[in-house]
Structure formats: structure tokens, C-alpha cells
Amino acid sequence: QPQGLSGMQGEPSLGDSSSGEDELGVDVLPSEEDAPEEADPPDGEDPPEVNSEDRMEESLGLEDLSTPEAPEHSQGSHGDEKGGGHSHWSYGGTLLWPQVSPACAGRFQSPVDIRLERTAFCRTLQPLELLGYELQPLPELSLSNNGHTVQLTLPPGLKMALGPGQEYRALQLHLHWGTSDHPGSEHTVNGHRFPAEIHVVHLSTAFSELHEALGRPGGLAVLAAFLQESPEENSAYEQLLSHLEEISEEGSKIEIPGLDVSALLPSDLSRYYRYEGSLTTPPCSQGVIWTVFNETVKLSAKQLHTLSVSLWGPRDSRLQLNFRATQPLNGRTIEASFPAAEDSSPEPVHVNSCFTAGD
């Protein structure tokens, strides 16, 4: 059995699950351990920017005390020389994001650090239901490099239910990653940053158009999973990664065969963390229901390397370290569908704190 975070003592053994995924086990993970933030920064305040050279050279495990931004040379800020005065934003200049979109200075932003001992076990959080995610090779899907990430646009028909009466349809999926020697997930667990993270973005069926849902509670829902290194190649991810060379240039878009989107997520859809946050890129609209799975998805070292070196972004720089710093919870509670807190009792705690999308 893969071991979870709860109640781990001493040296845990890393079990293999048939789907090639493991539970979140911080002590076991090959990527570097990032120290958790000591406390939430003051309201509406971004952590200080960290110089890229300082960040890459001083790998003392302390950098996530300020959850640093991606280095300036990775995603340099842009002027008007490209795109005719576009509202540019970059991972190297997240302190400027509120100027691009005021919502980025909101109180309930994403991503966040998931502190396991502070999660609230919520028994009403049922296993997620995915319908229609097993796509056939035809029709083909658009895979693009938009300069910030690699994006797979999903067709109509992928339906997901967070719970009774909370139905969504998938719009697209994208990834966040680091470099070969620095992890790049957006969410962290007890301060630990994983090599990479997948986001599947969904629109509530209560809204016919995206712009109507932005900023509305429960209007958007994102399924997130951490990518972790393992010896075996992940065949599902290979169907994406094998095409990255074709979209290496910013702005490239190709058509690839349809694939089983559910195979890109963990097999265990019953154990997850849930909170209300925001889009992690401008316009940083709030009201987004986040589901972060406890089980990680396993990719080979070669696959993670391919992800981190294949794409190019603005100003002929590598598209790397495309993650936002973790944001203060500002009083939010992260709920868990299982007893994740190490000292959790068999009975659910804070059971009345459970929220539903749209509350």
C-alpha cells in the first residue's frame, strides 16, 4: 500500500500502486524539501521578490519561507514591443500582477500551502465523479504553447461532479513545472514543493460562458494533482510529452490524438483537499473551487526533464519555473476528504465547516 502523510513515523516504505501513483509522502519524495512559511504575510501583501541568482544558488531549503517567484530570466517582464500594448505579466514579476488585474491582490488567492495538521476532515466530501474523460483518438485536440504553459484544449462532453448538483464541464488542462534541479508545483504540502503539477480547469454548468463564471463562487473548479518522479515511464503523459518538441516555440499550436484525460490524474479520486481560491494567473479571479488530490501521479525522471526543457517562452527564454508563490490563507480552512491531520481522531472534526460550491 502506498503510504499517506498521516501518522508516518520513522522511515516510511514507498509502496507501488498499480496505476503508478503514490500517496503524498513528504519524507519519501525525491524533489527538494522546501521549508514552510512561518506565517501568512499581511493581508493583500505578496511575499518579497527573490533575485533569480540568489534563488538558484542558495538552495538551503529556506527559499519557501518567502515562496519565491520564478527567476526574472525565466519569464522576463515585457513592454509594448510585442503584442501592441498587451497587459503583459510574467512569473518573474508577480508583485506587479495587481497592476495588471486588481483581483491578484485579493484575500483568497491560490495556490496555497496545505498544512496537513490544519486541514479539517470533512466526511461529506465524496469521491469525484468523472464522465466522458476517456477520449478517443479522433477528434484530435489542440495542444499549444502560450508562453506561460502547455495547454490542452478539451472538447465538450467531459463532465465532472464535485457533489450532488455541483456539475462542471472540463475546458482545458495545463501544467506547471520547475527546472531539472528545482521543483515547480504551485501548491505545496507542509512546505514541500513537488516537481510539477497538473490543473484541469472546469466551468460550472450553471454558466454557459466563461466570462459569466469568472469571480463567481463555484463558477470554476480546478482539479490538481502533483507529479512526482518514479522509475517507470507514464504512458498516458507520454502522449502529451512526445509532442512538446513540436510546440517548442511560443505561440505554436498543433493537433494531437485524443487521449484518456482521466489517466493523467490519480486513480484514487476519493482522497483530496478542498478549498476556495482563485486562478493562479492573471486575472486571478476568485471563487474557484480547488480539489488537490492526495495521491501523486508518477512520471519518469526523463519525462520530468522533457517537461522542463522542451518549451520556450517570451524573449527566447526557456519556459520554466512557471508557478506562483503560495498565497496566505487569510482565515480559510482547507478541508480533507479523509483524516489527513497527523493527530486527527477517527471522528471527523470541523464537520460543520464544510462548504459547497456556490455557498
Epitope: Q75, H78, K82, G83, G84, H86, S87, H88, W89, S90, V100, S101, S142, S144, N145, N146, G147, H148, T153, L171, Q172, V201, L203, L210, H211, E212, L214, G215, E250, G251, T281, P282, P283, S285, G313, P314
Partner: nanobody, 117 residues
Framework: QVQLQESGGGLVQPGGSLRLSCAAS???????????VAWYRQAPGKQRELVAV???????KYSDSVKGRFTISRDNAKNTILLQMNSLKPEDTAVYYC????????WGQGTQVTVSS
């Protein structure tokens, strides 16, 4: 509802110029500024192909067949995408579509460009 409306197409002689415009109407301001915007074209009997794009990160990319002749730009204040087409060739004849891509795709109805003497 977000709607994209192209204009500026027409009949032009080889070597001539046209300026296509695409206006986004509806409550799209909170999407448009953060989207990748693009022009595609579809010639009779052929697949739709990407002509030019401005990514959400601000970079521009052109298909090899239009490089140096076409220029894409955007005006976020007016929610408008422009395509300046110079030195037009008969093979540029197609229906041109504008596209806004932010979490989901938005498409215009298209405008016909015909290059013929």
C-alpha cells in the same frame, strides 16, 4: 455572451494591402486582456490554418507563408485584434477568422479575403 466580429475583408489585387479587424463585444474585457489572440484562415477545400498569434505572454508567431508580409496587433482598450496584410498573393485567398483563447476558445464568423487580378 462574448461575440467576435471580423471586418475589413474584400477583393484586392495581388501586391495590394488589407487591414482586418476583429472586435470583441459583450462582457469580454475580463477575458480579452489575458487571452492569446489569433487569426486563422481557411481556403476552399483546405483545413483551417493558423496565420498569426499573439500569446498571452505577449509573443507573436506567424505562419511561414505570411512572415514579413502580415502583422498582428491588439488593442486591449478597445478589445480589438488587427491583422495588417501587405504584399497579398492569390494564395492568401481564404475566409479569415479571429480567435480568442482564454480557458476556452471564442471564434468569429469569418471575413472573406479574395486576392485576384
Amino acid at each position: 455572451q462574448v461575440q467576435l466580429q471580423e471586418s475589413g475583408g474584400g477583393l484586392v489585387q495581388p501586391g495590394g494591402s488589407l487591414r482586418l479587424s476583429c472586435a470583441a463585444s459583450g462582457n469580454s474585457a475580463n477575458i480579452f486582456s489575458f487571452a492569446s489572440v489569433a487569426w486563422y484562415r481557411q481556403a476552399p477545400g483546405k483545413q483551417r490554418e493558423l496565420v498569426a498569434v499573439i500569446t498571452s505572454a505577449g509573443g507573436t508567431k506567424y505562419s511561414d507563408s505570411v512572415k514579413g508580409r502580415f502583422t498582428i496587433s491588439r488593442d486591449n482598450a478597445k478589445n480589438t485584434i488587427l491583422l495588417q496584410m501587405n504584399s497579398l498573393k492569390p494564395e492568401d485567398t481564404a475566409v479569415y477568422y479571429c480567435n480568442v483563447d482564454y480557458l476556452q476558445d471564442y471564434w468569429g464568423q469569418g471575413t472573406q479575403v479574395t486576392v485576384s487580378s
